[in-house]
């Protein structure tokens, strides 16, 4: 806490201005007014101040405004805001996405700090849904911020905030997340015809169903192995060769590379050796040609 | 060892067809695909497509799908690329090469020693 | 379709000395590049895959490197039985696409 004293004669401070810089803690503490320095917050981020003088200046803003800053003042806090703790942002009531993208900006090129999780949190709270432009703001400062959010989070996620959705954004999410985003997205791509619908469907495909491959198989769509390397094992398991041959196209051939990992390995156990033959890739492990194969949920269903 | 033998020269008239062919050899020819890949004189080396051998189904670069024809008789483990319409843009060096699967789609480790084809009236 | 890119066309060096191709491919492709000598009459021989996995038999006097879309392919110590046109191939899509090939001459 710095303490009270008088402003030095002909001292005090008339505008935010660069002759600021000059003055001790004591004496920003004692000759900036308060109020001015609300009206003039955009221009802090123009004057080099040192971390303690910012310090000085948080200290005052927090001083008129105890109970959190206006948006007019936040909007413009620009380094001031790296001061700010989780804490005092959660007094805030962020509505713009101006203001969101100021802060943003400032925090740009660095890992989500709590402070930045506890502005988009407030902000994202605020508006009661994640809508497209703000996703489209936030993935744009943080690829990966989706799939920074719970299942349960994502699912106040409008289906037609899908559209911002790029696929590196998509990179790091877990099946979980994707189990919440792909039936948003295949709602959102609806109307798109074939070959459109697969490009915009298939970063959220680690959460399809296997009728819905099933269905993408039908489609003359040439999945490629990555993406197939992802897809759900639960999803995988029961389609047929012939269905995942359809489903790849030209990919097929990459399942040879692949026969080792999930949910290649898992697939093959369920297949006929004499079907993955016909693959013309020596995928080995499959069920033996003349065993019979039971399956066991379904006799379980009828007793 | 792994063999793939292409017959030396071919030399054929401009509109007709030609079959060229590659017989392997020392490997279970229904366990990898075969690919044919086109050198033009002075030129570098072009994927033409490839064939799954177990059940004959082809999948072709999109400049060769109307010039190429990939088939296999499984019987003599050869596979064969027939070549129509021909003209002396055609005219070419041919190679059938078979890849390894270690990582990816595969990169081939073993090539015929290709098949010259001339198309000259 | 993946582009591949490689420089220089061709190129000429001295006995002993030391060269390097480059292919630039139009996206990134993984590592998953092989690079191949090739001699007239003869089918290309593989030296190099994924990147820089030397292949059985073949001296270290070869070498390769890079990751994304950019790799390099070197030769040190040339000998004359090196003189051949190189290329690349990725196979990080089934359609697969060649540098459009160097020609190394030795001066």
């Known amino acids: 806490e710095v303490e009270k004293t008088a402003c030095p004669s002909g001292k005090k401070a008339r505008e935010i201005d660069e002759s600021l810089i000059f003055y001790k803690k004591w004496e920003l503490e004692a000759c900036v007014d308060a109020a001015l320095l609300a009206t003039q917050m955009d221009r802090v981020n123009a004057i080099p101040f040192t971390y303690e003088q910012l310090d000085v200046l948080k200290h005052k803003l927090d001083e008129l405004y105890p109970q959190g800053y206006p948006e007019s003042v936040i909007q413009h806090l620009g380094y001031l805001f790296l001061k700010m703790s989780p804490e005092d942002i959660r007094k805030w009531n962020v509505t713009s996405l101006e203001t969101l993208k100021a802060l943003l900006e400032v925090n740009k090129g660095h890992e989500m700090s709590p402070q930045v999780a506890t502005l988009i949190d407030r902000f994202v709270k605020g508006r009661g849904q994640l809508d497209k432009d703000t996703l489209d703001t936030l993935t744009a400062f943080y690829p990966g911020y989706l799939c920074s959010l719970s299942p349960e989070e994502l699912s106040s996620v409008p289906p037609s905030s899908i559209w911002a959705v790029r696929p590196q954004d998509l990179d790091t999410c877990d099946p979980r997340q994707l189990d919440v985003l792909y039936p948003k997205a295949r709602l959102a791509f609806q109307n798109m015809n074939g070959s459109e619908y697969f490009v915009k469907i298939q970063s959220f495909l680690g959460g399809a169903p296997t009728e819905d491959l099933k269905a993408l198989s039908q489609q003359n769509v040439s999945m490629d192995l990555a993406t197939f390397m992802k897809l759900r094992t639960d999803a995988v398991l029961p389609l047929t060769v012939a269905e995942v041959q359809k489903l790849l196209g030209p990919h097929v051939e990459g399942l040879k590379a692949e026969e080792r990992h999930r949910p290649v390995r898992d697939w093959i156990l369920r297949q006929r050796q004499d079907d993955l033959d016909t693959l013309g890739l020596g995928l080995q492990g499959g069920i033996p040609n003349g065993y019979l194969v039971l399956d066991l949920s379904m006799q379980e269903a009828l007793s | 060892q792994v063999q793939l033998q292409q017959p030396g020269t071919e030399l054929v008239k401009p509109g007709a067809s030609v079959k060229l062919s590659c017989k392997a050899s020392?490997?279970?020819?229904?366990?990898?695909?075969m690919h044919w890949v086109k050198q033009r004189p002075g030129q570098g080396l072009e994927w033409i497509g490839n064939i799954n051998p177990s059940n004959g189904g082809p999948y072709y670069n999109e400049r060769f799908r109307s010039k190429a024809t990939l088939t296999v008789d499984k019987s003599s483990s050869t596979a064969y690329m027939q070549l129509s319409s021909l003209t002396s843009e055609d005219s070419a060096v041919y190679y059938c090469?078979?890849?390894?699967?270690?990582?990816?789609?595969?990169?081939?480790?073993?090539w015929g020693q290709g098949t010259t084809l001339t198309v000259s009236s | 379709d993946i582009q591949m890119t490689q420089s220089p066309s061709s190129l000429s060096a001295s006995l002993g000395g030391k060269v390097t191709i480059t292919c630039k491919a139009s996206?990134?492709?993984?590592?998953?590049i092989a690079w191949y000598q090739h001699k007239p009459g003869k089918g290309p021989r593989l030296l190099i895959h994924y990147t820089s996995e030397l292949q059985p038999g073949i001296p270290s006097r070869f070498s390769g490197n890079g990751s994304g879309r950019d790799y390099s392919f070197s030769i040190s110590n040339l000998e004359p039985e090196d003189i051949a046109t190189y290329y690349c191939l990725q196979y990080a899509n089934p359609l697969r696409t060649f540098g459009g090939g160097t020609k190394l001459e030795i001066k």
């Open positions: 996206q990134d492709i993984n590592k998953y």
């Open positions: 090469a078979r890849p390894y699967y270690g990582s990816s789609y595969g990169y081939f480790d073993y």
């Open positions: 020392g490997y279970t020819f229904t366990n990898y695909w």
